[in-house]
């Protein structure tokens, strides 16, 4: 039973401190007068990450975000006062929170902010070439930001700028009630979704917008919006949220009479991300949080990755679902949702669908309609009253590719990298959470490439304090991940092969597609490198198959066994600490009696209790003396991490030792302690103290006493000897290690 549930835990769990110590994270901890580093724009060509925040826009160097330029773009005092008088929070709302940051042309960006509840936009000059090093605000040219940025900083905008036109899904009013999808800028009249019609949009929250070609003809290009919204009455009993994908044609210019300056090609469909329940009722993950499009060889068919959470406050869960654009298109070509019947329920529309089918882009490909203004009235009227599709879009394989329900966090962001490995291509997901951690997950095929299983490689804490990750970008060029939150921006490498260990088996067990054993170390795998020594097994992570011929090599180069001697007292308790770096590894203990070769597996019971951190031996007996071997077993591969020699001192012997007059010769103590290392002496002394303090019921209470005593001594004697200081340092490290999973990467015995 101990093994169950281990597959769902991250193999490695790295704290923020560990990330810093191992140089695996670079953080920009924000400015005192700014926050909300939520709006990202990655520019691989210039090697810059542009970040929109409160009253600021930053340009970070992709190589190292410590190197950055900034533009200060606050609101005027007048605007701020107006905002305050409107009853808004001066710090959290009455500022210019940047919500839109898009590449406008070769030399400029387009930026929009909330402007203290008075949306505003402008252009930012970035120059033609990276070496121009230009980053300045065009403060002579400000534009109205209505329909581009929300008024309220709590709301998001999904934006996309193509061919000089800005597509944005946002709230267009002060109250945050008039939500719409807009197209502004450019030479044409602004276009928007129908107003005050809940069939079109019902209190949506926009996530992102993407241009996806429909055919080889650019006239057929569509812009897809991802959002979540309230389910329309009759669609669901009670108040519910639905995740949606919406489409509009890039060449939609509105209708000629009806839907003038409104989208005529807008359609939306529900995105399902659910798991079947035991009682036949599915558990739905409806709160769409983020979307990532993984481009394929065919630009018409990217894979859509969506991050979802549950709506329920009782049951908290997160899921990742994958969708294919062919499935999306199939739904948009399917039946329209239509309200009919005595109960006014939503049913599939059975009547005649006008031609050209509503939602089809006017083009030469489909019937020669030159413009949406040319569409006949029946198409427009049908489009106006039937914006929703009846069928939902189901995920690939009809289920999520990853679910997390047993944790205290929820997913918020996702980026995906396609990695070439020895045995094929793997998609590595980096998932941001609402507690400031990033999960690194790889999709591995079980029997076939269609049936995927998720392997949680790492859980990394990237911010000092728990904070919601609100933005993520991945640079394939730099092989770096960039993460945004209210607190700041973090940067981390996509791969850190050296952390897995110094042996082939450890590299293989990691199952990281970025890494392979190169014959001497675990390093970045490059498919172009024609080296037969590359060992990698992402699919199975089986070191026995891939590293069996290197076992001798591993032992030679790999870790040497850590050995310890511990002294315990009869009838007292002692704790043998051993926790492998990998949380997937199962710990297996063996006991070898003194002067015996035979090793036996330790049976658990009242006398011996296994914990996550090691073995607790209660009520020690003389027969417990001997060697305790701690092995880590993972994927059939066993490695010995630690050998502890336990010496149990009988009570009589102890009494004799303790009652020796200090002035006496004390030879027995000297004899016993002469063979001990400084740290062992400390352990011995502490165990003596534990026995003499029956009030200290637990190891924790005992440690607390020891630490308090140490602090007191340090305060009283600032000039205490070097020897004493070293002793304590050693002891603190030993104790500290108990609660640590993956500290000290160089500590060989733990590196499984």
């Amino acid at each position: 039973n101990y093994a169950n549930g281990k597959n769902n835990v991250p193999r490695l769990k790295l704290s923020y401190k560990e990330m810093l110590e191992s140089n695996n994270v670079i953080t920009f901890n924000g400015l005192a007068n700014s926050s909300s580093y939520h709006t990202f724009l990655l520019d691989e060509e210039r090697s810059r990450l542009y970040v929109g925040a409160k009253d600021h826009i930053f340009s970070f160097n992709l190589v190292n975000i410590k190197d950055f330029q900034k533009i200060v773009w606050p609101v005027s005092y007048t605007r701020r006062d107006e905002c305050k008088w409107a009853g808004k929070d001066i710090l959290k709302e009455c500022a210019n929170f940047i919500k839109v940051l898009e590449a406008y042309n070769q030399t400029h960006l387009y930026a929009c902010g909330t402007g203290a509840f008075h949306p505003i936009c402008t252009y930012i000059e970035v120059g033609h070439h990276p070496e121009d090093n230009i980053f300045k605000l065009q403060d002579s040219h400000f534009e109205n930001g209505r329909g581009k940025s929300p008024y309220d900083p709590k709301l998001l905008t999904a934006s996309l700028l193509i061919d000089g036109e800005l597509y944005s899904g946002t709230a267009a009013d002060f109250m945050g009630r008039d939500f719409a999808i807009f197209r502004t800028l450019g030479h044409h009249h602004p276009i928007r979704t129908e107003q005050h019609d809940s069939r079109w949009l019902n209190d949506p929250r926009f996530i992102s917008a993407h241009l996806i070609p429909e055919s080889d003809n650019p006239e057929d290009d569509k812009v897809y919006f991802f959002f979540r919204e309230n389910a329309i009455d009759g669609e669901h009993s009670g108040k519910a949220t639905h995740a949606r994908i919406g489409q509009i044609c890039k060449n939609d210019f509105g209708g000629h009479r009806s839907l003038v300056n409104k989208w005529t090609t807008f359609l939306k469909a529900r995105l399902i991300c659910s798991v079947p329940g035991p009682n036949g009722i599915d558990t739905h993950f409806d709160e769409l949080q983020d979307v990532f499009l993984m481009n394929s060889k065919d630009p018409k068919n990217p894979i859509v990755y969506g991050v979802f959470t549950t709506s329920s406050n009782i049951f908290k869960g997160s899921a990742v679902c994958m969708y294919s654009m062919s499935d999306v298109r199939r739904v948009f070509l399917g039946p329209y949702a239509h309200r009919d019947g005595p109960n006014y329920q939503w049913v599939p529309y059975q009547g005649r669908v006008p031609y050209p089918r509503p939602g089809t882009c006017p083009s030469k490909t489909f019937g020669g309609f030159d413009s949406t203004k040319d569409l006949p009235d029946d198409v427009i009227t049908f489009a106006r009253s039937h914006p929703a599709m009846y069928n939902p879009v189901f995920p690939i394989n009809n289920r999520p590719i990853m679910i997390k329900t047993d944790v205290n966090y929820q997913f918020t962001q996702i980026v995906v990298d396609r990695v070439d490995a020895e045995d094929g291509q793997y998609d590595v997901m980096f998932i941001g959470t609402d507690v400031g951690t990033v999960l690194k997950v790889v999709s591995v095929p079980k029997e076939t490439w269609h049936d995927l299983e998720e392997i949680l490689l790492e859980e990394m804490t990237v911010f000092r304090e728990p904070t919601t990750i609100s933005a993520m970008e991945l640079s394939t060029k730099q092989q770096q991940l960039y993460i945004g939150s209210t607190a700041g921006v973090a940067q981390l490498p996509l791969h850190r092969c050296d952390i897995y260990g110094k042996a082939c088996a450890e590299c293989c067990l990691a199952r990281d597609p970025y890494c392979a054993w190169d014959g001497s170390s675990c390093s970045r795998y490059f498919p172009t490198a024609k080296r037969r020594t590359r060992r990698q097994d992402i699919r199975n992570g089986d070191p026995l198959t891939h590293c069996s011929d290197l076992q001798h090599h591993d032992n030679h180069h790999g870790p040497s066994l850590e050995e310890r001697i511990i002294y315990g007292v009869e009838n007292s308790s002692t704790f043998l600490e051993c926790s492998p770096k990998s949380q997937r590894a199962l710990v297996y203990w063996q006991f070898q009696r003194r002067n015996e070769d035979r090793k036996e597996e330790i049976r658990m019971g009242d006398h011996i209790i296994r914990t996550e951190q090691g073995l607790l031996l209660r009520s020690l007996q003389k027969k417990d003396s001997g060697n305790y071997l701690c092995h880590a077993v993972e994927h059939g591969f066993m490695q010995t991490l630690l050998k502890v020699t336990l010496e149990v001192i009988d009570t009589e012997h102890l009494e004799e030792l303790l009652h020796k007059d200090d002035d006496g010769d004390g030879s027995k103590i000297k004899e016993m302690s002469s063979s001990m290392t400084p740290s062992q002496k400390v352990w011995y002394r502490d165990f003596m103290q534990l026995i003499n303090h029956p009030n200290l019921n637990t190891m924790d209470e005992f440690c607390e006493q020891v630490w308090k005593r140490d602090r007191k001594q340090r305060r009283q004697r600032p000039g205490h000897s070097q020897g004493s200081s070293n002793k304590w340092k050693h002891m603190q490290e030993s104790k500290k290690g108990r609660n640590r999973r993956t500290h000290e990467f160089e500590r060989a015995p733990r590196s499984v």
């Epitope: 000629h256 009479r257 006949p376 029946d378």
Partner: antibody
Framework: EVQLVESGGGLVQPGGSLRLSCAAS????????MSWVRQAPGKGLEWVST????????YYPDSVKDRFTISRDNSKNTLYLQMSSLRAEDTAVYYC??????????WGQGTTVTVSS | EIVLTQSPATLSLSPGERATLSCRAS??????LHWYQQKPGQAPRLLIK???QSISGIPARFSGSGSGTDFTLTITSLEPEDFAVYYC?????????FGGGTKLEIK
């Protein structure tokens, strides 16, 4: 001034074919949907066909579908109606009409088609 | 297809009187209804578009109302030249259909 002049009507035997033409002037022909509407002797109006601006698609009622074909030549400002497999019930005055996307705002004077043996 | 029913089939009134013509659709067509006038030996001409929108060159005494399924054409004070056949037509969906017509004759 908008003008629509139909031609090509006449007497034809059942099963026969006829091609009607409509010369348009006084407006930008290529900017409008065009339609044909007919009226049988002593009867009401019946919509026959509509073609979109580019000529790339046309609409028909079931009564004439697969027998009549509407077409246009925007370079010549001319609308056509090719009628085949004609029946006695196709006897009518055929009007060339501007519109069909919305209302039909201008009508020609009509051309008479008689199908009789 | 959408069927349009006009009533009455014949309406006999004197010049100067008010004429009210009705057109009922078999299903809701919004305001996608147009009215035409046809005099003997002439082509029809558009009077009202989209249920109530007037057409330039058409006298102000002609007005339209209604939406959904019930529509009305009103001629406030009949002139001698107004006596003709009036047709309604729906442009809501293909196939486009016309009503059977109302013949307005001099009493």
């Amino acid at each position: 001034e908008v003008q629509l002049v139909e031609s090509g009507g006449g007497l034809v035997q059942p099963g026969g074919s006829l091609r009607l033409s409509c010369a348009a002037s006084g407006f930008t022909f290529s900017s409008y949907y065009m339609s044909w509407v007919r009226q049988a002797p002593g009867k009401g109006l019946e919509w026959v066909s509509t073609i979109i601006k580019s000529g790339g698609y046309a609409y028909y009622p079931d009564s004439v579908k697969d027998r009549f074909t509407i077409s246009r030549d925007n370079s010549k400002n001319t609308l056509y109606l090719q009628m085949s497999s004609l029946r006695a019930e196709d006897t009518a005055v055929y009007y060339c009409v501007r519109g069909g996307q919305g209302a039909m705002d201008y009508w020609g004077q009509g051309t008479t088609v008689t199908v009789s043996s | 297809e959408i069927v349009l029913t006009q009533s009455p089939a014949t309406l006999s009134l004197s010049p100067g009187e008010r004429a009210t013509l009705s057109c009922r659709a078999s299903q809701s067509i919004g305001d996608y209804l147009h009215w035409y006038q046809q005099k003997p030996g002439q082509a029809p001409r558009l009077l009202i578009k989209y249920a109530s929108q007037s057409i330039s060159g058409i006298p102000a005494r002609f007005s339209g109302s209604g939406s959904g399924t019930d529509f009305t054409l009103t001629i406030t004070s009949l002139e001698p030249e107004d006596f003709a056949v009036y047709y309604c037509q729906q442009g809501y969906s293909f196939p486009y259909t016309f009503g059977g017509g109302t013949k307005l004759e001099i009493k």
